[in-house]
């Protein structure tokens, strides 16, 4: 289509760290520039429908304009690239959502118990709020055997009950991985024989 869309913004789906800097680039298509009698100088950037001051723009070339944000403090920013033709008609070119948050902290205080006759359950401290979808995975292994990962549910992100039957009288190694769009961290590993973690009914 000639005008649909008129260009694009790069990156397309950015996730950025809170209080960091971020630059987006809007690139216009040739057909669109021709139709609207415009070039990158006619680009107007907006966040949440408010026009960004021109001082934050950089004209890269005749087809591309960039905008830079410093110290991003909002969790969600609707960013649109628009063109103003004839000084009066504003046409949307493209839009993205900038999602902001924090990388996960290293999980702490990992501990596990085995309720008698049941499977092992571990819990931990997940650290600060990241404002992003953060996945916690409990990993465990015995000697050279890796047990199935235990992925924490969204509603209980700081605990997980393993799927496998507990083995006793051998040491297993357990740790937690926390991952989101901004990074991945691993807790300290703990070693124990599950027999010493049994909690009588």
């Amino acid at each position: 289509e000639l005008l649909d869309p008129c260009g694009y913004i790069s990156p397309e789906s950015p996730v950025v760290q809170l209080h960091s800097n971020f630059t987006a680039v809007c690139v216009l298509k040739e057909k669109c520039m021709d139709y609207f009698h415009v070039n990158a100088n006619y680009i107007v950037w907006k966040t949440n429908h408010f026009t960004i001051p021109k001082e934050q723009y950089t004209i890269i070339n005749r087809t591309a304009s960039s905008v830079t944000f410093t110290d991003i403090a909002s969790l969600n920013i609707q960013l649109t690239c628009n063109i103003l033709t004839f000084g009066q008609l504003e046409q949307n070119v493209y839009g993205i959502t900038i999602i902001s948050g924090l990388p996960p902290e290293k999980p702490k205080n990992l501990s596990c118990i085995v309720n008698e006759g049941k499977k092992m359950r571990c819990e931990w401290d997940g650290g600060r709020e990241t404002h992003l979808e953060t996945n916690f995975t409990l990993k465990s292994e015995w000697a050279t055997h890796k047990f199935a990962d235990c992925k924490a549910k969204r509603d209980t992100p700081t605990s997980c009950t393993v799927d496998y039957s507990t083995v006793y009288f051998v040491n297993i190694e357990v740790w937690v991985e926390a991952e989101n769009a901004l990074g991945k961290v691993t807790s300290d590993h703990i070693n124990f024989d599950p027999v010493y973690k049994v909690k009588p009914n």
């Epitope: 289509e1 139709y35 009698h37």
Partner: antibody, heavy 118, light 107 residues
Framework: QVQLVQSGAEVKKPGSSVKVSCKVS????????WSWVRQAPGQGLEWIGR???????NYNPSLKDRVTMTVDTSTSTHYMELSSLRSEDTAVYYC????????????WGQGTLVTVSS | DIQMTQSPSSLSASVGDRVTITCRAS???????LAWYQQKPGKAPKLLIY???SRATGVPSRFSGSGSGTDFTLTISSLQPEDFATYYC????????FGGGTKVEIK
């Protein structure tokens, strides 16, 4: 071949409203802006306004308080409604495609005569 | 808004004549933003020229446009029977405005 087919002639009373339609065939409605232009009997041409499929509009300042343009993408039809009609609104109303560039009218409808008379 | 004034408002000419129609803008218009249309009685206008001198698809080479700033010209190098019509200039640098028209009649 692009074709713009407009609704039929209308006779209206002063103070009332008129809504004229323009159905686009043989080309994509989403590829261009669409304008309305009117011509009073024996007179020149006057641009009314333009619309894009997103609903983005741009009106002639002299008519903006009385004109509303809409688009129905499911039927590839756009509409121009003019309210508070007066006798000087009597004219042939044309829809037109803006191409090959914005502001240029390369395809036109056949015209719709709107007569405002008491 | 930009006013467009055409002259003459009408003219009589014969087949084969060279015809020149002028259009003056009330303020400077970018040469990218000027178009000419032909309209016959009871019909919709037809695009002839845009961007001052670019011919629209299918328009014969006898039609040409020129000019800059506030003064623009449409020339028909050799008038043909089918060219008897009314001609309008139009600027589209702001919201579009048209000239009052020039009627080309048979002498």
């Amino acid at each position: 071949q692009v074709q713009l087919v407009q609704s039929g002639a209308e006779v209206k009373k002063p103070g009332s409203s008129v809504k004229v339609s323009c159905k686009v065939s043989g080309g994509s409605i989403s590829s261009y802006y669409w304008s309305w232009v009117r011509q009073a009997p024996g007179q020149g041409l006057e641009w009314i306004g333009r619309i894009y499929i997103t609903g983005n509009t741009n009106y002639n300042p002299s008519l903006k308080d009385r004109v509303t343009m809409t688009v129905d993408t499911s039927t590839s039809t756009h509409y121009m409604e003019l309210s508070s009609l007066r006798s000087e609104d009597t004219a042939v109303y044309y829809c037109a495609r803006e191409g090959p560039k914005l502001g240029i009218f390369d395809y036109w409808g056949q015209g719709t005569l709107v007569t405002v008379s008491s | 808004d930009i006013q467009m004034t055409q002259s003459p408002s009408s003219l009589s000419a014969s087949v084969g004549d060279r015809v020149t129609i002028t259009c003056r803008a009330s303020q400077s218009v970018s040469s990218s933003y000027l178009a000419w249309y032909q309209q016959k009685p009871g019909k919709a206008p037809k695009l002839l020229i845009y961007g001052t001198e670019s011919r629209a698809t299918g328009v014969p080479s006898r039609f040409s446009g020129s000019g800059s700033g506030t003064d623009f010209t449409l020339t028909i190098s050799s008038l043909q029977p089918e060219d008897f019509a009314t001609y309008y200039c139009q600027q589209y640098g702001g919201y579009p405005t048209f000239g009052g028209g020039t009627k080309v009649e048979i002498k």
